[in-house]
């Protein structure tokens, strides 16, 4: 038993670290693998992760953490039984990957304009709470052309936008995503997307 | 220093209730962990109580014999008691916080393992 | 739960000698097993972990193997500091349960 890929993982800054391999072969991964993450801090626990599958012969185990500081580095070690197969290092703070961002809500009972709302999916104490910029996503459902991303540099968690940019009559989705330039991080997963029936008033037009 | 402090303990009739409480200190806020509880009577070997999750799932396992009569609970990551209802003589003994590993398998199944760091116990005597 | 059952339950040994105790579990533990010293008066001190894994600063003479039901501590040569009780600790994936040995106290012959 070989690992082919060696593990890379990602932090949400938060509470958790995910991270994935690949194996030489179909692997059982629960019942074989033992991830073992201990945060390099005088007697600090060693704590065991059980991997889950990932496809055929990919893994993925979950490290939890009370909190992340970027100093933060834990040692992994990566077990088969009583054999060792791989040994390594993961510093957080090095390896973003923020948490998506949540409740995205449209609404459209602001005169002709449209305001997206969602949640920051970080508590205030948390360092990345004051950092994230986002990227808004907006397509039709019926018109796979009509595609565009409204990127949000403000802290805000909102975008305002004319319904006239849009096309009326017809049914739009959003969906909106994080980052955070201090961290050089990866994008967030996209959050839940919400649905809504576009329609505003065209303006008379005067001859 | 890291160090876990116990208090609480003392003199108390049977059929009475007392609340051990635990402060930990000196560790890594970074560090998720469980909060255990151990016992040991006059003379007797160790005995495992149950154990919290200092994180915010706060999960939660007992020894079989402890359901119902102990409870452990938690102020935040760094401070947990023990609650004893129903005291009897045979629950004389000294009490022990200590700090534990655990396994995880996902999220949202965490378990207890072995105990890292110990306090130095709190004595308690149940006699009338 | 689980049962441990430790043995002996008593030794008596001298210094330099090389001691063994053993540890069976009820059901399997893979490799969830750590050992314990226990001075009269005093806290237990974690000795191994993961059934063979030395925790911080415990010298070398101290060796843990096994996995799955059978367990084994291993002092290669007793030194006076070494006179205490230890104890297993088992602990069971299935029900979250941790349980100890009865203890193995290490008398000076």
């Known amino acids: 038993m070989k690992v082919l890929q060696e593990p890379t993982c990602v932090s949400d800054y938060m509470s958790i670290s995910t991270c994935e391999w690949k194996m030489n072969g179909p692997t059982n991964c629960s019942t074989e693998l033992r991830l073992l993450y201990q945060l390099v801090f005088l007697l600090s626990e060693a704590h065991t992760c059980i991997p889950e599958n990932n496809g055929g012969a990919g893994c993925v185990c979950h490290l939890l953490m009370d909190d992340v500081v970027s100093a933060d580095n834990y040692t992994l070690d990566l077990w088969a039984g009583q054999q060792l197969l791989w040994k390594g290092s993961f510093k957080p703070s090095e390896h973003v990957k923020p948490r998506a961002p949540g409740n995205l809500t449209v609404h459209t009972n602001v005169s002709d304009t449209l305001l997206l709302t969602w949640s920051n999916p970080y508590p205030p104490d948390n360092y990345l709470y004051n950092h994230l910029t986002y990227a808004v996503n907006i397509w039709s459902e019926n018109d796979p052309a009509d595609f565009r991303i409204y990127n949000v540099t403000y802290l805000e968690p909102s975008l305002r936008i004319a319904a006239s940019t849009l096309k009326s009559g017809i049914s739009y989705r959003a969906r909106v995503r994080a980052w955070a330039q201090c961290y050089n991080t990866t994008w967030s997963e996209w959050s839940p997307s919400t649905k809504w029936h576009n329609s505003y008033r065209e303006p008379f037009e005067q001859h | 220093e890291v160090q876990l402090v116990e208090s609480g303990g003392g003199r108390v009739q049977p059929g009475g209730s007392l609340r051990l409480s635990c402060a930990a200190s000196g560790f890594s806020s970074s560090s998720a962990h469980y909060m255990c509880w151990v016992r040991q009577a006059p003379g007797k070997g160790l005995e495992w109580i149950g154990c919290?999750?200092?994180?915010?799932?706060?999960?939660t396992y007992y020894a079989s014999w402890a359901k119902g009569r102990f409870t452990i609970s938690k102020a935040s990551s760094t401070t947990v008691y023990l609650q004893m209802n129903s005291l009897r003589a045979e629950d004389t003994a000294t009490y022990y916080c200590a700090r534990a590993a655990f396994v995880n398998r996902g999220v949202s199944w965490i378990w207890p393992y072995y105990f890292s760091l110990w306090g130095q116990g709190t004595q308690v005597t149940v006699s009338s | 739960d689980i049962q441990m059952t430790q043995s002996p339950s008593s030794l008596s040994a001298s210094v330099g000698d090389r001691v063994t105790i053993t540890c069976q579990a009820s059901?399997?533990?893979?490799?969830?097993l750590a050992w314990y010293q226990q001075k009269p008066g005093k806290a237990p001190k974690l000795l191994i972990y993961r059934a063979s894994t030395l925790a911080y600063g415990v010298p070398s003479r101290f060796s843990g193997s096994g996995s799955g039901t059978d367990f084994t501590l291993t002092i290669s040569s007793l030194q006076p500091e070494d006179f205490a009780t230890y104890y297993c600790?088992?602990?069971?994936?299935?029900?979250?349960?941790?349980?100890f040995g009865q203890g193995t106290k290490v008398e000076i012959k």
């Open positions: 059901e399997d533990i893979e490799s969830y």
């Open positions: 600790l088992g602990s069971s994936y299935s029900t979250g349960s941790n349980i």
């Open positions: 919290i999750y200092a994180g915010s799932r706060g999960s």
